[in-house]
Structures are given as structure tokens and as C-alpha cells.
């Protein structure tokens, strides 16, 4: 099928970075400046994304791949391919429609994005509170109260590695 298609359609021979130019007898022409084609056989090149304003360029556009944007300091990416930049807040705060607000007592946010969340209720999971929560940190739950018999060694919580929201999609 592929061989038949290429015999019938000269455009299928045009590689990425070019387009099949109908105005020039279906010759493969290079993509004009600020445009790209990431696959072969395309009849047009796509306009490169421009990273402006709060967006900054993470990867320049080439003839075969689109530009990639991220956000300027003080903002973080949201959406597929960083389609939006949202304002950072401090840990211990959440971004509301009126700006950054401190977490209420009993809630925390250990990120620069997202909401303030209630502290974990250790007793609901049959455990006891080992370390109290703050605006910036959830409580740390330890062994169940029954396990805390005299002579039992206390548990040192491991240092957090990467929290939700800090890993690539």
C-alpha cells in the first residue's frame, strides 16, 4: 500500500521540514522561516508557537519541531504543553480568585500551586500523630497508639523526595 501510495502521490516523498508545494508542481519546498512540519508528506507547514509575555522559550522552533515554552519565574505551567502559566503562591498559601491567601488552620499546602488541603486525620487510618501539621506541611502519622508501648522506638519520618505536582507528566 505504501509503495502504491508513493507512486500515486509525489507528496508522500516530502520529508519532515518540507511541504508539498502545489504552486510549484508538487515539489518539496523547505518550510518558510517560523514554520515547521514534524512529519513527512505534509501539504503545509505549521506556524511555530511563539513564547511571549509570561511564557519563555524552552526549546527553539526548528524546521521539523515546534517551539516549546515554559513560564517565567514566579509562574508555573498548566495544561498540555504548558498552554497556560499560573501565578505561584508561597508554600502555606493557595491561589484564589482574589490572589494568594494563607491556608486556614488545619490545612496545608506544601506546593507553590494548588489548594490548601486538610491535615491527614491519622486516627482514621488507625495511627497516631507523630509530627504536628503546619500551614506548609501535613501531619506525619506514626504507629497506631497500641503500638506505642514502653520501650518501642519512635519512627523518624523519611525526608520527602518529590511531592505531587513536582514531577513531569
Amino acid at each position: 500500500f505504501e509503495r502504491t501510495r508513493s507512486l500515486q502521490d509525489p507528496c508522500s516523498n516530502c520529508p519532515a521540514g518540507t511541504f508539498c508545494d502545489n504552486n510549484r508542481n508538487q515539489i518539496c519546498s523547505p518550510c518558510p522561516p517560523n514554520s515547521f512540519s514534524s512529519a513527512g508528506g505534509q501539504r503545509t507547514c505549521d506556524i511555530c508557537r511563539q513564547c511571549k509575555g509570561v511564557f519563555r522559550t524552552r526549546k527553539e522552533c526548528s524546521s521539523t519541531s515546534n517551539a516549546e515554552c515554559d513560564c517565567t519565574p514566579g509562574f508555573h505551567c498548566l495544561g498540555a504543553g504548558c498552554s497556560m502559566c499560573e501565578q505561584d503562591c508561597k508554600q502555606g498559601q493557595e491561589l484564589t480568585k482574589k490572589g494568594c491567601k494563607d491556608c486556614c488552620f488545619g490545612t496545608f499546602n506544601d506546593q507553590k500551586r494548588g489548594i490548601c488541603r486538610p491535615w491527614t486525620n491519622c486516627s482514621l487510618d488507625g495511627k497516631s500523630v507523630l509530627v504536628n501539621g503546619t500551614k506548609e506541611r501535613d501531619v506525619v502519622c506514626g504507629p497506631s497508639p497500641a503500638d506505642l508501648s514502653p520501650g518501642a522506638s519512635s519512627v523518624t519520618p523519611p525526608a520527602p523526595a518529590r511531592e505531587p505536582g513536582h514531577s513531569p507528566q
Epitope: 498548566l78 487510618d125 502519622c141 518529590r162 511531592e163 513536582h166 514531577s167
Partner: antibody, heavy 117, light 106 residues
Framework: QMQLVQSGAEVKKPGASVKVSCKAS????????MHWVRQAPGQGLEWMGW????????NYAQKFQGRVTITRDTSASTAYMELSSLRSEDTAVYYC?????????????WGQGTLVT | SYELTQPPSVSVAPGKTARITCGGN??????VHWYQQKPGQAPVLVIY???DRPSGIPERFSGSNSGNTATLTISRVEAGDEADYYC?????????FGGGTQLTVL
């Protein structure tokens, strides 16, 4: 490709417990909160709770507190939901759902569901 | 506890615009997410943070939120849009879903 695959259907007697698993693949399991939502036959969606896969921290809907336990095994990239003291009204499809990058409780990827009868 | 009210059903002719509402006290101050659920399938996020669209969701889907009402708008409705639609918010310590709206394409 990112997906959440849940364990198979279960039939339980009243008073028993059920434990449903949700295996994540195609993304960093520890980086995203995992939620559980259920749907009784012909009814709407009902949120049960979440787990932070990094810390194990949880939050449960008041309705289920004392009956539900949500845990995770980071080495297996799997979240679990255990519901105890089952009654007929607990017959439902149980879904796990990943919270998105905005971390505003938007559930951007769902498992296929597990029917518990 | 916080309550979200949706109309049980909405009917629309193909090619027309469907509007599904979600009512709640001062809902405009909250972030609203919308899900589409087709029979026998898991829900799919179609709008988040009031009006943002996940990748893969057509531009025909849009959202707005102010006062006491959030609205999901589906323009140029197609037969494939027939489904149940749920709104969702976060209120203090709980995720709350609306009762759902069945969209029928006539």
C-alpha cells in the same frame, strides 16, 4: 501511554470488606494525588477520598469516615481502596482517578471502574 | 454541606448550542470542573478551572462561572456529545459533584 488499571469485579456478602486496586503506569505515580469515586447503578458520582502517594496522607469524605481506608504501594505504583462493613447500598462501580497537575481537584484520568456487588 | 444543583436533562438539536448549568451558593468564587460520562464508560474531564480545556477536548466545549451559576456550553452539538455531564467543586474539606445532567441530542 498513561493509564489506570483497576482490579476485577467483586461480589461480597453484607458485613464483609472489599479491597479494590488501581495500578498506574505511564507517569510518575508519586507525583499526583489519587482519588476514589463511586457510582451506584443509575446514580451520580460520589467522592470517597484521596491519598497522597508520596507521603501516604489521606482525606476522606465524612460519609465514609471509619469505613474506608485508602492506601498506596509506591513500589508497585498502585493505590488501594478498602471499604468495610458492606451493605446493599454500597453496590456501585468504584473508580480511581488521578488529580491533575494544577492540583485543584481536577480529575484528569480515570480507571475503567470496578463493579462491587 | 455544599450542594450543587444541575437540571436532570437537557435536549438539543444537532448543530445547535447546549447549555448545562450548575448552581451553588457563590459558586463563582470556586473552581468548577466538568466531566462527560457516556453509558458504560468512565467519566472524562472536559473543562477544568471554570473554562480551561484539556488537550483532546474540542473547542466546541467551553465553560463560564460567576455569581451562583457555572455553565458548560457545547456549541455545534453532535450526536456523539450525548452523555451525562457532571460539575464538581472543592468545598472546605470535600469534593462535591452535581447530580448530573443527561444531554439528549434530538
Amino acid at each position: 501511554q498513561m493509564q489506570l488499571v483497576q482490579s476485577g469485579a467483586e461480589v461480597k456478602k453484607p458485613g464483609a470488606s472489599v479491597k479494590v486496586s488501581c495500578k498506574a503506569s505511564g507517569y510518575s505515580f508519586s507525583g499526583y494525588y489519587m482519588h476514589w469515586v463511586r457510582q451506584a447503578p443509575g446514580q451520580g458520582l460520589e467522592w470517597m477520598g484521596w491519598v497522597n502517594p508520596m507521603s501516604g496522607g489521606t482525606n476522606y469524605a465524612q460519609k465514609f469516615q471509619g469505613r474506608v481506608t485508602i492506601t498506596r504501594d509506591t513500589s508497585a505504583s498502585t493505590a488501594y481502596m478498602e471499604l468495610s462493613s458492606l451493605r446493599s447500598e454500597d453496590t456501585a462501580v468504584y473508580y480511581c482517578a488521578r488529580e491533575g497537575m494544577a492540583m485543584r481537584l481536577e480529575l484528569d484520568k480515570w480507571g475503567q471502574g470496578t463493579l462491587v456487588t | 454541606s455544599y450542594e450543587l444543583t444541575q437540571p436532570p436533562s437537557v435536549s438539543v438539536a444537532p448543530g445547535k448550542t447546549a447549555r448545562i448549568t450548575c448552581g451553588g451558593n457563590n459558586i463563582g468564587s470556586k473552581s468548577v470542573h466538568w466531566y462527560q460520562q457516556k453509558p458504560g464508560q468512565a467519566p472524562v474531564l472536559v473543562i477544568y478551572y471554570d473554562s480551561d480545556r484539556p488537550s483532546g477536548i474540542p473547542e466546541r466545549f467551553s465553560g463560564s462561572n460567576s455569581g451562583n451559576t457555572a455553565t458548560l456550553t457545547i456549541s455545534r452539538v453532535e450526536a456523539g456529545d450525548e452523555a451525562d455531564y457532571y460539575c464538581q467543586v472543592w468545598d472546605s474539606s470535600s469534593v462535591v459533584f452535581g447530580g448530573g445532567t443527561q444531554l439528549t441530542v434530538l
